[in-house]
C-alpha cells in the first residue's frame, strides 16, 4: 500500500488556503472531484465537489471553499478563504469514480488555523476578498453522499508535528449551494 | 532520506547541447511535480521548468521556451533536462528540485550541476 | 509575470541580534510563499512556507508573516549559522514561479 503522507499549514484567521491537488489527465479530467475532510475515526466528509462532468476553469464556490478544475493542467485548485479557527484539520482531494471507490489524490492536507494578525502593515488579499462582493448565483451541489467503506475505514495517526484536530464541524454556510465566481486572477 | 543528485553539467559552446540528469531517491518519484531551477554566478534563483507528476503536465521560463525540454522517466526515478541552442546567458548551476504535494514550492533540492557557455 | 522585490539588498546584523527581511509581490499571491536561505557553495534550503509555517526542522527562531503583497522573515536571535542569502519565492498562480532578488545578511 501506499504511504500517505501528509502536508501541513498553519495559517492564521482570515487568510486563504490555496492548494493544488494533479490528476491524471488523460483518467480524471471531466471526473467529477471533491474537497473532504477526515475527523478522527470518522469516514471522510465531502465538503465541496465539482460538477458533474467537471467543467474546465470553472469556479464553483460552497460557502467559503472554492473549487476550480483546470483540464489543460491536471489541477484541482481549491481555496479555503477567511479561514476560521475551527477549520483546523485533515483535508484531501478525491476523484469521484463510480462504482468504483474515490481515488484520492495526494498528499493530505493538515491545515492548522491560529488566532492573530495574519498580515503586515499595509498587505491585503484582495483576491479572497472579492468573492463577497459578487452577486451569486446558485445551484444545488450534486456531491454523492457516500464514501466506499474501503476509502478510509480510520483516520490515519497525527502528524508527527503533533497538531490537534477540533471535534468541532466545520464552520461553512450554504453548503448544499454552488456559486460560480469569475476566475481570480 | 531524500536525495537529488543532478549530472550532466560541463563546457558547451554557445549553439551547442547538454543533457541534465537528476537521479532521486527517497520518496515516490512518479507522485511529485519536479522542477528545475538555476543560479548564474553571483546572482539570484531563477525558475527555469517544471514537470507534475500524475498529469505530466510541462512548463517552461520565457528565457529558455522553445530551447529547452523537461522529462522524466518514474521507471528510473530520474527527471531530465535537455537544453539546446545553448546562450552564454544560460551559464548557470543548474538544481533540481522536488515540489511539494500540494504546491510548486521547492522543500528539497540537489546540490546543483554547472552549466559553462562559453567560446 | 509576479514581481517579487526583497530589501534591504544587504542588511548587517550583530549575532544575538534580530532581523527582519521584507518582500513585496507586485500583486496578491494570498499566503502563497515561501522562503528559503542558502550559504555559500550550498543549494537553497526550505525555511517557510504558506507565509508562517514553518519546515521540517527549521528552528522556532525563524519565522514568516504577511499576506497579499507584503511579507516578512523573522529572525528573533541571529546565530553564526544564519548568515547567509535568503530568498523569498511565489507560488500563486501557474509559472512562472518568481523569486525576489535575495537579501544578504552579513555580520555586523
Known amino acids: 500500500a501506499t504511504k500517505l503522507t501528509e502536508e501541513k499549514y498553519e495559517l492564521k484567521e482570515g487568510q486563504t488556503l490555496d492548494v493544488k491537488c494533479d490528476y491524471t489527465l488523460e483518467k480524471f479530467a471531466s471526473s467529477q472531484k471533491a474537497w473532504q475532510i477526515i475527523r478522527d475515526g470518522e469516514m471522510p466528509k465531502t465538503l465541496a465537489c465539482t460538477e458533474r462532468p467537471s467543467k474546465n476553469s470553472h469556479p464553483v464556490q460552497v460557502g467559503r471553499i472554492i473549487l476550480e478544475d483546470y483540464h489543460d493542467h491536471g489541477l484541482l485548485r481549491v481555496r479555503m478563504v477567511n479561514l476560521q479557527v475551527e477549520d483546523s484539520g485533515l483535508y484531501q482531494c478525491v476523484i469521484y469514480q463510480p462504482p468504483k471507490e474515490p481515488h484520492m489524490l495526494f498528499d493530505r492536507i493538515r491545515l492548522v488555523v491560529t488566532k492573530g494578525f495574519s498580515g503586515t502593515p499595509g498587505s491585503n488579499e484582495n483576491s479572497t476578498q472579492n468573492v463577497y462582493k459578487i452577486p451569486p448565483t446558485t445551484t444545488k451541489a450534486l456531491c454523492p453522499l457516500y464514501t466506499s467503506p474501503r476509502t478510509v475505514t480510520q483516520a490515519p495517526p497525527k502528524s508527527t508535528a503533533d497538531v490537534s484536530t477540533p471535534d468541532s464541524e466545520i464552520n461553512l454556510t450554504n453548503v448544499t449551494d454552488i456559486i460560480r465566481v469569475p476566475v481570480f486572477n | 532520506e531524500v536525495q537529488l543528485l543532478e549530472s550532466g553539467g560541463g563546457l558547451v559552446q554557445p549553439g551547442g547541447s547538454l543533457r541534465l540528469s537528476c537521479a532521486v531517491s527517497g520518496f515516490t518519484f512518479s507522485r511529485y511535480a519536479m522542477s528545475w531551477v538555476r543560479q548564474a554566478p553571483g546572482k539570484g534563483l531563477e525558475w527555469v521548468s517544471e514537470?507534475?507528476?500524475?498529469?505530466?503536465?510541462?512548463y517552461y521560463a520565457d528565457s529558455v521556451k522553445g530551447r529547452f525540454t523537461i522529462s522524466r522517466d518514474n521507471s528510473k526515478n530520474t527527471l531530465y533536462l535537455q537544453m539546446n541552442s545553448l546562450r552564454v546567458e544560460d551559464t548557470a548551476i543548474y538544481y533540481c528540485?522536488?515540489?511539494?504535494?500540494?504546491?510548486?514550492?521547492?522543500?528539497?533540492w540537489g546540490q546543483g550541476t554547472l552549466v559553462t557557455v562559453s567560446s | 509575470e509576479i514581481v517579487m522585490t526583497q530589501s534591504p539588498a544587504t542588511l548587517s546584523v550583530s549575532p544575538g541580534e534580530r532581523a527582519t527581511l521584507s518582500c513585496r509581490a507586485s500583486q496578491s499571491v494570498n499566503a502563497n510563499l515561501a522562503w528559503y536561505q542558502q550559504k555559500p557553495g550550498q543549494a537553497p534550503r526550505l525555511l517557510i512556507y504558506g507565509a508562517s509555517t514553518r519546515a521540517t526542522g527549521i528552528p522556532a527562531r525563524f519565522s514568516g508573516s504577511g499576506s497579499g503583497t507584503e511579507f516578512t522573515l523573522t529572525i528573533s536571535s541571529l546565530q553564526s549559522e544564519d548568515f547567509a542569502v535568503y530568498y523569498c519565492q511565489q507560488f500563486y498562480n501557474f509559472p512562472p514561479y518568481t523569486f525576489g532578488q535575495g537579501t544578504k545578511v552579513e555580520i555586523k
Open positions: 514537470m507534475r507528476g500524475s498529469s505530466g503536465s510541462t
Open positions: 528540485a522536488k515540489e511539494f504535494s500540494s504546491n510548486s514550492l521547492f522543500d528539497y
